[in-house]
């Protein structure tokens, strides 16, 4: 059994048929020693009596919310959750396998630019009854600080008859030196709880790996005279790490027909402007990617060639 | 040139010589991003490579302020994968394929510490630890790492010359 | 908890060969390096010989011809013989370990010792 | 082989005072490329096995009193303990690892004047 925060502890369960479970004592926080009975979250039935109270844990039905009383009086709580081990493995039933890159991808994180500052999110199909806390720090034996916000509902969406919910946070590395070639990772930590059940999921990463720059900016086309080309320039978003001249991009303009079977010609440059032939109907695609460092590419900015 | 008194390095060359040295480092090992390293432990072998830190003066302001520092830095960075990709954890068993990118790598790195450093002038002798043996079995791994680190560290001096070829070239 | 735990016979005579075993716990022998290390009577430490992650040796030269390191990954052990055994091979014998890297590195754990007397 | 020179050999001092030991080796141990310097400190105590106290010259191995602390560079190191108790009283060694073979330093003892 541990703390996770103040009154509540989390008691860790091997979890199998007839498993003994854990031994649990608790105290009443009061410097009062007689009277003192318990009772369980909203039951009136008397637990036990006296400044400790010895529990058996063994499954769902053993947790909750302890409250201590004197005559009518509550002294104190202490509110037990369950972390389930099956086969050795802590369980992971509140969050959703997001399958990108790797299986086992609970948490997924991306970064704008080098400033230290990034996103990381996660899906779930549970609704109510749930809390999520987060923490993050560059290393782990000798850590320095990441300061995350409170972890938010970003997005729902539906798939099939279930309903899908996105939560992100935002975490800022505190001393972050964005030109530093990193050599200890970011780890994340999130702890989940739904009802009385208890989950921490982690990911660990270097920034540089989660980089995806925001996708070109004022991508325009100018027409060249009596010709089918067109010149297409665009500018580095506003969201990317300056100066341009250290951290450069490099960018792939995609051609592209109505019809998705049509052939896709596609120019690699690290200039912020080219020369392509404009078909009609067609569109132009622009994308970035760090210059020097082959982490994500952007999403595509476009503009139709009419 | 960077030399030890203080002037210049061919900013230009070394530009475009680092920009090929991340193309090949990533052509060694392009799907280096599928394999969490974390998962295998020896978390050892990416601390005993060499990394541009932040007093390193490898950043803008730092470049502007007194370059030879980075500069420095790089080279003894440059001269230590050197020396790791011609270890017999490149050339032992298991066999790199005939047309493996890291025999151009290994020349690339050792061209651009010469770019960096002439004949006839020295920073300081520079010493790399004698390498613990590694068996076949080891060696996948190892050159793995080393050269998802060289990745990390060649980006880092790549954007160096772009931006000392953009503002510090005479 | 890591741990490393040695026996062997204390009490040799001239030309006997030593032998000594050490368990290991609460880590592998293909993670890490293990090592012999000697101290005479009242003397300083003295490198004898290591056997890699990859199950090769290497030994101290002046001991080379006379001393053989071998594992048993299985059981998690390690031993150290030394041949034709003199009253100068008389010392605390310790084994140790130390992490695997690309490069040698200190050792962090040792075993507790053992006395060997080399007497006729 | 790198010989590791360590002095004095014997250090006579009284608890709460300052003891600094010398260890130089006769070629360098810094890796440039990395910057770290092969070299540790360890105590020994009659009778028991030695203990590591700092390992890459300067970092100190956890459960090590912040009293000892480890400085140098190259071929030149240092190990302080910046206020003697009763317990430090005993020998110390420096170890290089930066080539094989590992190499020992012939010991400092400390002791109780």
């Known amino acids: 059994i541990w703390e996770l925060k103040k009154d509540v502890y989390v008691v860790e369960l091997d979890w199998y048929p007839d498993a003994p479970g854990e031994m649990v004592v608790l105290t009443c926080d009061t410097p009062e020693e007689d009277g003192i009975t318990w009772t369980l979250d909203q039951s009136s039935e008397v637990l036990g009596s006296g400044k400790t109270l010895t529990i058996q844990v063994k499954e769902f039905g053993d947790a909750g919310q302890y409250t201590c009383h004197k005559g009518g009086e509550v002294l104190s709580h202490s509110l037990l959750l369950l972390h389930k081990k099956e086969d050795g493995i802590w369980s992971t039933d509140i969050l959703k396998d997001q399958k990108e890159p790797k299986n086992k991808t609970f948490l997924r994180c991306e970064a704008k630019n080098y400033s230290g500052r990034f996103t990381c999110w996660w899906l779930t199909t549970i609704s109510t009854d749930l809390t999520f806390s987060v923490k993050s720090s560059r290393g782990s034996s000798d850590p320095q600080g990441v300061t995350c916000g409170a972890a938010t509902l970003s997005a729902e969406r539906v798939r099939g008859d279930n309903k899908e919910y996105e939560y992100s946070v935002e975490c800022q590395e505190d001393s972050a030196c964005p030109a530093a070639e990193e050599s200890l990772p970011i780890e994340v930590m999130v702890d989940a709880v739904h009802k009385l059940k208890y989950e921490n999921y982690t990911s660990s990463f270097f920034i540089r790996d989660i980089i995806k720059p925001d996708p070109p900016k004022n991508l325009q086309l100018k027409p060249l005279k009596n010709s089918r080309q067109v010149e297409v320039s665009w500018e580095y978003p506003d969201t990317w790490s300056t100066p341009h001249s250290y951290f450069s991009l490099t960018f792939c303009v995609q051609v592209q027909g109505k019809s998705k079977r049509e052939k896709k010609d596609r120019v690699f440059t690290d200039k912020t402007s080219a020369t392509v032939i404009c078909r009609k109907n067609a569109s132009i695609s622009v994308r970035a990617q760090d210059r020097y460092y082959s982490s994500s590419w952007s999403e595509w900015a476009s503009v139709p060639c009419s | 040139r960077a030399v030890p008194g203080g002037s210049s390095p061919a900013w230009t060359q070394c530009q475009q010589l680092s920009q090929k040295l991340c193309t090949l480092a990533w052509s060694a090992h392009p799907l280096v991003g599928h394999m969490d390293l974390r998962e295998e432990g020896d978390e050892e072998t990416t601390n005993d490579v060499p990394h541009i830190q932040c007093g390193d003066g490898c950043d803008p302001q730092g470049l502007r302020d007194n370059s030879q520092f980075c500069l420095q830095r790089i080279h003894q960075g440059l001269i230590f994968y050197e020396k790791l990709l011609g270890s017999d954890i490149f050339t032992g068993e298991p066999s790199l394929l005939p047309d493996s990118p890291v025999g151009q790598l290994h020349a690339s790195l050792l061209g651009l510490s010469q770019l960096l450093q002439p004949e006839g002038h020295h920073w300081e002798t520079q010493q790399i630890p004698s390498l613990s043996p590694s068996q076949p079995w080891q060696r996948l791994l190892l050159r793995f790492k080393i050269l998802r680190s060289l990745q990390a560290f060649v980006a880092v001096a790549a954007r160096v010359f772009a931006h000392g070829a953009a503002t510090l070239s005479p | 908890e890591v741990q490393l735990q040695q026996w062997g016979a204390g009490l040799l005579k001239p030309s006997e060969t030593l032998s000594l075993t050490c368990a290991v716990y609460?880590?592998?022998?293909?993670?890490?390096?293990v090592h012999w290390i000697r101290q005479p009577p009242g003397k300083g430490l003295e490198w004898i010989g290591v056997?890699?992650?990859?199950?090769?040796?290497d030994y101290n030269s002046v001991l080379k011809s006379r001393v053989t390191i071998s594992r048993d990954t299985s059981k998690n052990q390690f031993s150290l013989k030394l041949s034709s055994v003199t009253a100068a091979d008389t010392a605390v014998y310790y084994c140790?370990?130390?992490?695997?890297?690309?490069?040698?590195?200190?050792?962090?754990?040792w075993g507790q010792g053992t006395l060997v007397t080399v007497s006729s | 082989e790198i010989v590791l020179t360590q002095s004095p050999a014997t250090l006579s001092l009284s608890p709460g005072e300052r003891a600094t030991l010398s260890c130089k080796p006769s070629?360098?141990?810094?890796?440039?490329?990395?910057?770290?310097?092969?070299l540790a400190w360890y105590q020994q105590k009659p009778g028991q096995a030695p203990r590591l106290l700092i390992y890459?010259?300067?970092t100190r191995q956890s459960g090590i009193p912040d009293r000892f602390s480890g400085s140098g560079s190259g071929t030149d190191f240092t190990l302080t303990i910046s206020r003697l108790e009763p317990e430090d009283f005993a020998v110390y060694y420096c170890?290089?690892?930066?080539?094989?073979?590992?190499?020992f330093g012939g010991g400092t003892k400390v002791e109780i004047k």
């Open positions: 140790a370990r130390d992490k695997y890297g690309l490069f040698p590195g200190y050792f962090d754990y």
């Open positions: 609460g880590f592998s022998l293909i993670s890490y390096n």
């Open positions: 056997i890699w992650t990859g199950g090769s040796t």
């Open positions: 070629q360098s141990l810094l890796s440039s490329g990395n910057r770290k310097n092969y």
């Open positions: 890459y010259a300067s």
């Open positions: 170890l290089q690892h930066f080539n094989y073979p590992w190499t």
